[in-house]
Amino acid sequence: EQAPGTAPCSRGRSWSADLDKCMDCASCRARPHSDFCLGCAAAPPAPFRLLWP
């Protein structure tokens, strides 16, 4: 993982200062308030993950 300023995170990932590493934007579906989600190009269109069908 690269620190901010040294190299960007790879496509589909965003830097989390909270976790000190690049994180997958896909996880923003379940945890939309994560700090790195602000850096993801676009929020996934699906709503927050259902707990039960």
Epitope: C28, A30, P45, W52
Partner: antibody, heavy 119, light 111 residues
Framework: EVKLGESGGGLVQPGGSMKLSCVAS????????MNWVRQSPEKGLEWVAE??????????HYAESAKGRFTISRDDSRSSVYLQMNNLRAEDTAIYYC??????????WGQGTSVTVSS | DIVLTQSPASLAVSLGQRATISCKAS??????????MQWYQQRPGQSPKLLIK???KLDSGVPARFSGSGSGTDFTLNIHPVEEEDTATYYC?????????FGGGTRLEIK
């Protein structure tokens, strides 16, 4: 280096109780949801329970097979997660693993602790 | 609950050849952007280990011999070229909703 150490397994009679523990290190425990997953030859890998964060009021979720009998809890000060299992049945016999997840992936697994329910 | 059906249940592949494992979900586990499917490897006598997340993203440290593909309900794990150390059981797992469920596993033997 991430380490997960499960303990508390053993032999218990049907109807009995058991409390499993898992001590974690090497990752920011307070920021990860924690899961218990079990594995048996009969049912394969089976998710059992999940506990979320303090900011989520430690929300818990259970598989149908665990509801009403199992209770998951965590102690962030000890980087530990627990599984209290009551009214145990033969079909609860399995290896029990704890695993952290940030959102979707069970990133790390411990070595597991074996639970045998038999008379 | 979402049911994950893996096939084949077991397969034997010659060293250096390709192993292909399928996982079919009883309903879609994909958005237009991401697929919520993971693959795990469990070597004999060991705990499961995350290999692939979100259908196609290799976890850190996983060799490029492993690849994942698919979306919707149909997913595939490919290993090429297979090596001796790939002898293991492979499981798919979805994170679309609770409860999380796993496939029944595919046992890979290297000939």
């Amino acid at each position: 280096e991430v380490k997960l150490g499960e303990s508390g397994g053993g032999l218990v009679q049907p109807g009995g109780s058991m409390k499993l523990s898992c001590v974690a290190s090497g990752f920011p425990f307070t920021k990860y949801w924690m899961n218990w997953v079990r594995q048996s030859p009969e049912k394969g890998l089976e998710w059992v329970a999940e506990i979320r964060l303090k900011s989520d009021n430690y929300a818990t979720h259970y598989a149908e097979s665990a509801k009403g009998r199992f209770t998951i809890s965590r102690d962030d000060s000890r980087s530990s997660v627990y599984l209290q299992m009551n009214n145990l049945r033969a079909e609860d016999t399995a290896i029990y693993y704890c695993s952290p997840t940030y959102a979707d992936t069970m990133d790390y697994w411990g070595q597991g602790t074996s639970v045998t329910v038999s008379s | 609950d979402i049911v994950l059906t893996q096939s084949p249940a077991s397969l034997a592949v010659s060293l250096g050849q390709r192993a292909t494992i399928s996982c079919k979900a009883s309903q879609s586990v994909s958005t237009s952007t991401y697929s919520y499917m993971q693959w795990y490897q469990q070597r004999p006598g060991q705990s499961p280990k995350l290999l692939i997340k979100y259908a196609s993203k290799l976890d850190s440290g996983v060799p490029a011999r492993f690849s994942g593909s698919g979306s919707g309900t149909d997913f595939t794990l490919n290993i090429h070229p297979v090596e001796e150390e790939d002898t293991a059981t492979y499981y798919c797992q979805h994170s679309w909703e609770l409860p999380y469920t796993f496939g029944g596993g595919t046992r890979l033997e290297i000939k």
